[in-house]
């Protein structure tokens, strides 16, 4: 974020230049934050969509947004907002979020490509030992949920623990 602060586009409060913070930053709208996925552009005096700068200079405020945008363009990957990282769906199929459903469901149709533990799960040999060995482990406890890719298969909180946000 620029030191000028960020402005909520569409805000109507007038900036009075007599009013200042000690640091010399203007008060009023220039100190308010922009809506999510926008940044304050001090030269435009406006909140702008982060999309406008992802291909240019990745301004601090937009860094996570721009990373998630480029991640979403990569097939078989999704952006995890808690990890702030681009995750390969291939590495978490079976304990995957909805963003990976298409990729993982297609992958699961050819069992040859599956790791041994998932092949066992598909053939009914579901082991009930939640020993934190889930490939994608807990960031957020959601309790026991059915895997979107394997209906009926219950996963432990440790295995599920996903951020289901796009």
């Amino acid at each position: 974020m620029s030191g000028l602060g960020r402005s909520r586009r569409g805000g109507r409060s007038r900036v009075d230049q007599e009013e200042r913070f000690p640091q010399g930053l203007w008060t009023g709208v220039a100190m308010r934050s922009c809506p999510e996925e926008q940044y304050w552009d001090p030269l435009l005096g406006t909140c702008m969509s982060c999309k406008t700068i992802c291909n240019h200079q990745s301004q601090r405020t937009c860094a996570a947004f721009c990373r998630s945008l480029s991640c979403r363009k990569e097939q078989g990957k999704f952006y995890d907002h808690l990890l702030r990282d681009c995750i390969s769906c291939a590495s978490i199929c079976g304990q995957h979020p909805k963003q990976c459903a298409y990729f993982c469901e297609n992958k699961l149709r050819s069992p040859v490509n599956l790791p041994p533990e998932l092949r066992r799960q598909r053939s009914g040999e579901v082991e009930n030992n939640s020993d934190n060995s889930g490939r994608y482990q807990g960031l957020e406890h959601r309790g026991s949920e059915a895997s979107p890719a394997l209906p009926g298969l219950k996963l432990s909180a440790d295995q599920v623990a996903l951020v289901y946000s796009t």
């Epitope: 030191g3 000028l4 109507r12 001090p42 030269l43 702008m48 240019h56 200079q57 601090r60």
Partner: antibody, heavy 118, light 107 residues
Framework: QVQLVESGGGVVQPGRSLRLSCAAS????????LHWVRQAPGKGLEWVAL????????YYADSVKGRFTISRDNSKNTLYLQMNSLRAEDTAVYYC???????????WGQGTLVTVSS | DIQMTQSPSSLSASVGDRVTITCRAS??????LGWYQQKPGKAPKRLIY???SLQSGVPSRFSGSGSGTEFTLTISSLQPEDFATYYC?????????FGGGTKVEIK
Amino acid sequence: QVQLVESGGGVVQPGRSLRLSCAASGFTFSSYGLHWVRQAPGKGLEWVALISYDGSNKYYADSVKGRFTISRDNSKNTLYLQMNSLRAEDTAVYYCWYSSSWTPLDYWGQGTLVTVSS
Amino acid sequence: DIQMTQSPSSLSASVGDRVTITCRASQGIRNDLGWYQQKPGKAPKRLIYAASSLQSGVPSRFSGSGSGTEFTLTISSLQPEDFATYYCLQYYSYPLTFGGGTKVEIK
């Protein structure tokens, strides 16, 4: 393409007023903030004022605060600078400027000369 | 207000020379800085934005670096058309402030 064309400059006596205009084309005028920047003869650049896209927020250099008013008419795609109580030190070329901080967007008008002299 | 101190105020150089211009901010401004070139009777032209990003259409011999309070504009191999005055601009806080300028003259 983006065009910014200033007008309204001229010779004016100290203490009098003048209004500069900047006609804009080639971009969505009502979406962006615009600036006035000036340059006294043989001197450097001095930022004067900025107005937000909707005119609700205005920022001024200390040297013009209380004397100059920046405004805009989005229906006419025009930026204005109302200059009151003019002083000799306001003599300069005044540029209309439109720029973005983190993208390559940066456009300037050709400038209009204001001379404050008795 | 943030003061931008530019140095040198003028320099003489030959075609092919490497030229470095420095801008120092009176307080930290992150990378909220641009570099402008101006020729007599013309409007300024931006060369660099966000301290180090090259403006589209600007030759790659121009480069910017720095963050915080110290910034540099480098022309790797001076060309005849580069003889001009260069300004830095901080946009970290209002009022926006330009450096005093550096005039690059032919030796």
